[in-house]
Interface confidence: medium
């Protein structure tokens, strides 16, 4: 803590301006009124204070607002935001998207810090759900944001927000997250025509059930192998060779390169070798001709 000392004669700050960069820490503490600082926070960002000097300014605000800063101050924190701890931020009530954007801008280009994570958490909880504008903003700054949420948190995302999601926003999502997002995406894009619908839904297909994949196979979508490899194994296994051929279109030839990897490997093991041979790709490992295929899934469900 900075010790209390009297302000030297003639040094009392009448406004927040560049002259303050010449003030020692103790002079800032003694000569800058906290209320003046709070009303002129927007100026702080334009002044090249040292980090030590910023420590003093933060200390003054902390003394003025021990219960947490008001939004009028938070919105203009600028680089002073980098000085805040998650504990500081938990005291805030941030409701304005403009405030959120202003603070995210300060951290732009860096990994999501604990401070930013806390800020976003406070903001989203205050709003009650991840609306489209918020999601737009968060994914613009942090493309991986959506995939950092738990399936429970994702359940609060309204289908209308899905329009804001870009393919790269889902790169790090795991199957449990896509299970939650896919039905929302399906609802969001339901009124689009076939080819447009596929373009939009493609990134979410890691959460699609078998029946939806069967339906897509009837629409000449030409799914690429990268998308196919991200599908749920349990959704791919029941597809017939003909359905996979229709689903992939000209990309079907890529199955050969992926025959040792899931879900292709597991799918091959479920197909008749005769059927696989019709693809002319030399895929091996199917059920030999003359073998009886039993569907044990019903028996397992009953036992």
């Amino acid at each position: 803590e900075v010790e209390k000392t009297a302000c030297p004669s003639g040094k009392k700050a009448r406004e927040i301006d560049e002259s303050l960069i010449f003030y020692k820490k103790w002079e800032l503490e003694a000569c800058v009124d906290a209320a003046l600082l709070a009303t002129q926070m927007d100026r702080v960002n334009a002044i090249p204070f040292t980090y030590e000097q910023l420590d003093v300014l933060k200390h003054k605000l902390d003394e003025l607002y021990p219960q947490g800063y008001p939004e009028s101050v938070i919105q203009h924190l600028g680089y002073l935001f980098l000085k805040m701890s998650p504990e500081d931020i938990r005291k805030w009530n941030v409701t304005s998207l403009e405030t959120l954007k202003a603070l995210l801008e300060v951290n732009k280009g860096h990994e999501m810090s604990p401070q930013v994570a806390t800020l976003i958490d406070r903001f989203v909880k205050g709003r009650g759900q991840l609306d489209k504008d918020t999601l737009d903003t968060l994914t613009a700054f942090y493309p991986g944001y959506l995939c950092s949420l738990s399936p429970e948190e994702l359940s609060s995302v309204p289908p209308s927000s899905i329009w804001a999601v870009r393919p790269q926003d889902l790169d790090t999502c795991d199957p449990r997250q896509l299970d939650v997002l896919y039905p929302k995406a399906r609802l969001a894009f339901q009124n689009m025509n076939g080819s447009e619908y596929f373009v939009k839904i493609q990134s979410f297909l890691g959460g699609a059930p078998t029946e939806d994949l069967k339906a897509l196979s009837q629409q000449n979508v030409s799914m690429d192998l990268a998308t196919f490899m991200k599908l749920r194994t349990d959704a791919v296994l029941p597809l017939t060779v003909a359905e996979v051929q229709k689903l992939l279109g000209p990309h079907v030839e890529g199955l050969k390169a992926e025959e040792r990897h899931r879900p292709v490997r597991d799918w091959i093991l479920r197909q008749r070798q005769d059927d696989l041979d019709t693809l002319g790709l030399g895929l091996q490992g199917g059920i030999p001709n003359g073998y009886l295929v039993l569907d044990l899934s019903m028996q397992e469900a009953l036992s």
């Epitope: 960069i21 090249p48 030590e52």
Partner: antibody, heavy 120, light 107 residues
Framework: QVQLQQSGPGLVKPSQTLSLTCAIS??????????WGWIRQSPGRGLEWLGR?????????DYAVSVKSRITINPDTSKNQFSLQLNSVTPEDTAVYYC??????????WGQGTLVTVSS | DIQMTQSPSSLSASVGDRVTITCRAS??????LAWYQQKPGKAPKLLIY???TLQSGVPSRFSGSGSGTDFTLTISSLQPEDFATYYC?????????FGQGTKVEIK
């Protein structure tokens, strides 16, 4: 493009005053966004920041603790330059002295440097 | 004062090499760090400030990283004009201080 041109003697006797001048082109010594500083470099002490001045509705300065009692930096607005005076020099003050423009504490433009030797 | 320690103090490298210089602060300085390049008989030149922001006009082969106490200057592919001495400088504190320098020589 900002340029800084240094001038001053290269030899000073012990106990005397070292005086150097830095002429600015491409910016103003009275700029409210920059400050103007002096730095020195010697084999023994490496790079050492000495002090700075800047105009912020009035002239302001601050100096490194190590030289605070001996240093003065002054502006000359009519010639758009600033000067360094270091009193009571000793051989320890032998160094290459640089002037520089400071944005905050980042030194983005430097003078060419002046080797000052303190010797009798 | 905050002490800045650079390593190595010198290194030998060839044109095209990737070169890494580290700078450690004696206490946390957030990202208040600058890097300078100095050639013999010349003044230092600002390369990077804010730990990672490239100064205007500096080639993109130079990059900086780090925060807190540990920082790195990287030259992705060393060029003939890059043989010089490199200094880090902290400006977290009012008393700015520099590292002792790292000399990059031709192997």
């Amino acid at each position: 493009q900002v340029q800084l041109q240094q001038s001053g003697p290269g030899l000073v006797k012990p106990s005397q005053t070292l005086s150097l001048t830095c002429a600015i082109s491409g910016d103003s010594v009275s700029s409210r966004s920059a400050a103007w500083g002096w730095i020195r470099q010697s084999p023994g002490r490496g790079l050492e920041w000495l002090g700075r001045i800047g105009y912020r509705s009035k002239w302001m300065n601050d100096y490194a603790v190590s030289v605070k009692s001996r240093i003065t930096i002054n502006p000359d607005t009519s010639k758009n330059q600033f000067s360094l005076q270091l009193n009571s020099v000793t051989p320890e003050d032998t160094a290459v002295y640089y002037c520089a423009r400071m944005q905050g504490f980042q030194l983005d433009y430097w003078g060419q440097g002046t080797l000052v030797t303190v010797s009798s | 004062d905050i002490q800045m320690t650079q390593s190595p103090s010198s290194l030998s490298a060839s044109v095209g090499d990737r070169v890494t210089i580290t700078c450690r602060a004696s206490q946390t300085i957030s990202s208040a760090l600058a890097w300078y390049q100095q050639k013999p008989g010349k003044a230092p030149k600002l390369l990077i400030y804010g730990a990672s922001t490239l100064q205007s006009g500096v080639p993109s082969r130079f990059s900086g990283s780090g925060s807190g106490t540990d920082f790195t200057l990287t030259i992705s592919s060393l060029q003939p004009e890059d043989f010089a001495t490199y200094y880090c400088q902290q400006y977290y504190s009012y008393s700015v201080t520099f590292g002792q320098g790292t000399k990059v020589e031709i192997k």
